[in-house]
């Protein structure tokens, strides 16, 4: 086998590493793989970065291609721009370097495209189908600092072997990112292990200074020390632990402060307490107790779904109004009948991490298909056309030529169409005020891929997020989601919100699917009451109609252990949407930071007419939404910006850590 295709390799500088993974993957799979390791697909924006990529890739075969982090949605050509309408997967279009194989050709750009780099020659950039599994991919990892490679010593048995935080093992590094481990073997038979750690005086450095292969005081057997052995001047040895561990009572072994599981989700050694807690993707630390994690309500983030959104613990799902069906991406809606009948099957296949077990996964996915249950309809406001992602650059329009989005009048009530992906009824024992904005804006229609979660410990049954059996064919049936389908009731004339009070019987036996809510409509506000909710079921909640003034709407507090649902008034901050001149963003959305308890499923109409003010559940501030790998979707009409009130706020609602188990919906890019 060609050495080019054998093992992953990396090249690191003082603040970032590029890594080449010669594994055949689609763009989506490659992007996920980089994210799983804590990085992103490579974004070589400068000639210097491109040079590092060139030296890493070397002279490969002409037939080999490697994904980099550039993607363009259908009909998004901007041929006069350096990136031609392509956007880095980090969400922007800033670049000081391009390496296109051909000059831009004027064309309609009808399809989504991704960029691969030729492994041979000048490593030119080629565009092509994102669903093609090319020969490999380039990841980029940024970090706070790096340690220089260790100098070889006279007593060494061989070069130091380095292991990076992204699991690459090599002797060929010039710089080692923070968190790397260096293993040095000495001729005397013993060795030393060093960690690239933060130094008390600032910066990073190796956990131990050289020389590493001198003296015999700690020899043999490392002086009985589990981690580091230190030879004192008087000849005796003392033991030390590497960063993140503390010396145990015996003075020799080292303890992991995270072993006592002080954190609800993820624990990282270090910090003043000896550890720090982190939350998985879809969750954030509770403000009153950073050890705990609360659900992030992705449905409150501008444009998660093209039309309607349901939030649940650790994830969300998208829904479509009557006459529309959810596309295979699980995000976009298309007029009914426009998609193939296999769409839900397609998604299961499309989002597989690898091609290895496709047949098994297909079978598991098909097992869902007989499980649909028709139910009475839910009242909905007709959603409107979605705007596009924010870009770093925005073309100027004269004041009178600001692009406008046509907003159709809300139709009351457009019923909900059936979700294409099984609705999961995992255990939820959380509360959240449920408030829906009628002016909630949306990211563009698109096929947005999931974020693959990082490695994490298995959760107890009570903490598991939804699992789609297509990705886990071997799950016992008890863990497989129930499936909910909705058919609509007759619509009254448009613009006349009906007065309705309807009781629905208990349609689902326990351990199958959530109870269907009893919905009462008063004016334009809908509050939802659930009949008996069996334990371990996540109820589906519908809230709010169109054109609501600022108010303190009713909030639902739902506990799956309880069958009575108190309705608690909660003051909510308002969301103001206003049109601006081209100099400032087209839509400014003020989203104050606030504590949110973990969410039950919340159905949101994604969007409604502009220039209205209505309540929205608070969420923490966001900077510009990152661009995400997506499948093809209709052309968006307008860019959307989210302000960043707090400069230190996390850029996305989805953290860097992963989810316990991912479903078809729980790990979408936002």
């Amino acid at each position: 086998q060609d050495p080019w295709a054998a093992e992953p390799r990396a090249a690191c500088g003082p603040s970032s590493c590029y890594a080449l993974f010669p594994r055949r993957r689609t763009f989506l799979e490659a992007w996920r793989a980089c994210r799983e390791l804590g990085g992103d697909l490579a974004t070589p924006r400068t000639p210097e970065e491109a040079q590092r990529v060139d030296s890493l890739v070397g002279a490969g075969p002409a037939s080999r291609l490697l994904w980099i982090g550039l993607q363009r949605q259908a009909r998004q050509c901007q041929l006069q721009r350096p990136l031609r309408g392509f956007t880095w997967t980090t969400g922007d279009q800033d670049t000081a370097f391009t390496n296109w194989a051909q000059p831009a050709s004027g064309g309609p750009c009808p399809a989504q495209r991704c960029v691969a780099l030729e492994a041979s020659g000048e490593h030119r950039w080629l565009e092509g189908s994102c669903t093609l599994a090319v020969d490999g991919y380039l990841c980029q990892f940024g970090f706070e600092g790096a340690c220089p490679a260790l100098q070889d010593e006279a007593g060494q048995a061989g070069p130091a072997v380095y292991t990076t935080p992204f699991h690459l093992v090599s002797t060929e590094f010039e710089w080692l990112p923070f968190g790397s481990v260096a293993a040095v073997q000495c001729q005397a038979g013993r060795g030393a292990s060093l960690l690239c750690v933060k130094q008390p005086e600032g910066g990073v450095g190796w956990s131990r200074a050289g020389p590493l292969c001198l003296g015999t005081g700690c020899s043999p057997d490392n002086g009985g020390c589990e981690h580091e052995c230190v030879e004192e001047v008087d000849g005796h040895v003392s033991c030390r632990c590497t960063e993140g561990f503390r010396l145990a009572a015996d003075g020799r072994s080292c303890e992991d402060p995270c072993a006592q599981a002080p954190c609800e989700q993820q624990c990282e050694p270090g910090g003043p307490q000896g550890y720090s807690c982190h939350c998985r993707l879809g969750f954030r630390p509770a403000e009153d107790d950073p050890h705990r994690c609360v659900d992030t309500d992705e449905c409150q983030i501008a444009g998660v779904c093209q039309q309607m959104c349901v939030n649940y613990v650790g994830g969300f799902e998208c829904y479509c109004s009557e006459g529309h069906e959810l596309e295979a991406d699980g995000i976009s809606c298309s007029p009914a009948g426009a998609m193939g009948a296999q769409a839900s099957q397609d998604l299961g296949d499309e989002l597989l991490d690898d091609g290895e077990d496709e047949e098994d996964e297909d079978e598991a996915w098909k097992a869902f298909n007989g499980g649909w249950t028709e139910m009475p309809g839910i009242l909905w406001m007709e959603p409107t056309q979605p705007p596009d992602f924010a870009l770093a650059y925005r073309p100027s329009f004269p004041e009178d030529r600001e692009p406008q989005i046509p907003y159709p009048e809300p139709t009351w009530p457009p019923p909900l169409s059936a979700p294409r992906v099984p609705y999961h009824s995992s255990v939820l024992s959380v509360t959240r005020p449920v408030v829906v904005s009628a002016t909630h804006p949306t990211l563009p229609s698109a096929h947005q891929p999931p974020v693959i979660p990082a490695t994490h410990p298995a959760l107890s049954r009570d903490h598991q997020i939804p699992v789609i059996a297509a990705n886990y064919p071997d799950l016992p049936s008890a863990y497989q989601p129930g499936i909910l389908s909705v058919s609509h009731s007759a619509q009254p004339p448009a613009h006349q919100p009906p007065m309705i009070s309807t009781k629905y019987p208990e349609l689902f036996p326990a351990h199958q699917s959530p109870m269907f809510p009893d919905t009462r409509v008063a004016g334009t506000q809908t509050t939802t009451h659930l009949p008996g909710i069996p334990p371990n079921h996540a109820p589906l909640v519908t809230t709010l109609g169109a054109q609501l003034p600022p108010q303190a709407p009713d909030a639902l507090v739902l506990r799956t252990q309880a069958t009575q649902l108190p309705i608690i008034p909660t003051a909510q901050p308002s969301l103001t949407t206003t049109s601006r001149s081209p100099v400032s963003p087209a839509h400014q959305i003020s989203v104050p930071a606030a504590t949110q308890p973990a969410a039950l499923p919340t159905l949101l109409p994604s969007q409604s007419p502009t220039n209205q003010t209505s309540p929205i559940s608070p969420t923490h501030p966001h900077s510009k939404a990152p661009q995400i790998p997506r499948e093809d979707g209709p052309s968006p009409k307008l860019a959307l910006w989210l302000p960043s009130p707090a400069p230190t706020a996390a850029p996305t609602a989805l953290g860097e850590a992963g989810l316990a188990e991912h479903s078809q919906r729980d790990d979408r890019w936002l």
Partner: antibody
Framework: QVQLVQSGPEVKKPGASVKLSCKAS????????IHWVKQAPGQRLEWMGY????????TYNQKFKGRVTITVDTSASTAYMELNSLRSEDTAVYYC?????????????????WGQGTLVTVSS | DIQLTQSPSFLSASVGDRVTITCRAS??????VAWYQQKPGKAPKLLIY???NRYTGVPSRFSGSGSGTEFTLTISSLQPEDFATYYC??????????FGQGTKLEIK
């Protein structure tokens, strides 16, 4: 210009083996993957497998796995496809085809050049 | 495996006609679709790659469109030399190529 020239027709008995050749010219042989495609009379085209002459990397269609072997001789710029344990349903025209790498700045895996085909008849 | 279904299987048309052939995939294949023309006793010839890109030297009367699961090949004005069999091919799960069953275009 790019050409793929295949060996002549073969008549074989059931249970026998056949080895077809595909000689490439007009381009750098190791820069492009070679695929083999079967077309039985009145049937659709069926992909059998490929080889990357750069590193002899091969992948086969599960349907033919165990019976088909694809090899190359880079010095002769030639690809070979050997099919064993022949049966009557193996009677078909077999094509070698080159996988394109890029066209006008696009990468794509369609098959841009094909050999003229070799008819293999399996009959007792 | 991804299945490709072409329609119609047979098509009679006259010179100058506009003809459309459809190819449906059993699951999303993005734009990883090509169209080939094959004449009796000859090898297939590449017409369209990546769903909508015309291959070098292919006349402009041939065009391709679609993405996801539905694709079309259109011949805007049939010429005598266009009567042949047309195949669609997907390669999204490369290297596992699959082909449609073919559409035979005959002179009316």
């Amino acid at each position: 210009q790019v050409q793929l020239v295949q060996s002549g027709p073969e008549v074989k008995k059931p249970g026998a083996s056949v080895k077809l050749s595909c000689k490439a010219s007009g381009y750098t042989f190791t820069d492009y993957v070679i695929h083999w495609v079967k077309q039985a009379p009145g049937q659709r085209l069926e992909w059998m497998g490929y080889i990357n002459p750069y590193d002899d990397d091969t992948t086969y269609n599960q349907k033919f796995k165990g019976r088909v072997t694809i090899t190359v001789d880079t010095s002769a710029s030639t690809a070979y496809m050997e099919l064993n344990s022949l049966r009557s349903e193996d009677t078909a025209v077999y094509y070698c085809a080159r996988r394109g790498n890029s066209y006008d700045g696009y990468f794509d895996y369609s098959m841009d050049y094909w050999g003229q085909g070799t008819l293999v008849t399996v009959s007792s | 495996d991804i299945q490709l279904t072409q329609s119609p299987s047979f098509l009679s048309a006259s010179v100058g006609d506009r003809v459309t052939i459809t190819c449906r995939a059993s699951q999303n294949v993005g734009t990883a679709v090509a169209w080939y023309q094959q004449k009796p006793g000859k090898a297939p010839k590449l017409l369209i790659y990546s769903a909508s890109n015309r291959y070098t030297g292919v006349p402009s009367r041939f065009s391709g469109s679609g993405s996801g699961t539905e694709f079309t090949l259109t011949i805007s004005s049939l010429q005598p030399e266009d009567f042949a069999t047309y195949y669609c091919q997907q390669y999204t799960n490369y290297p596992m190529y699959t082909f449609g069953q073919g559409t035979k275009l005959e002179i009316k």
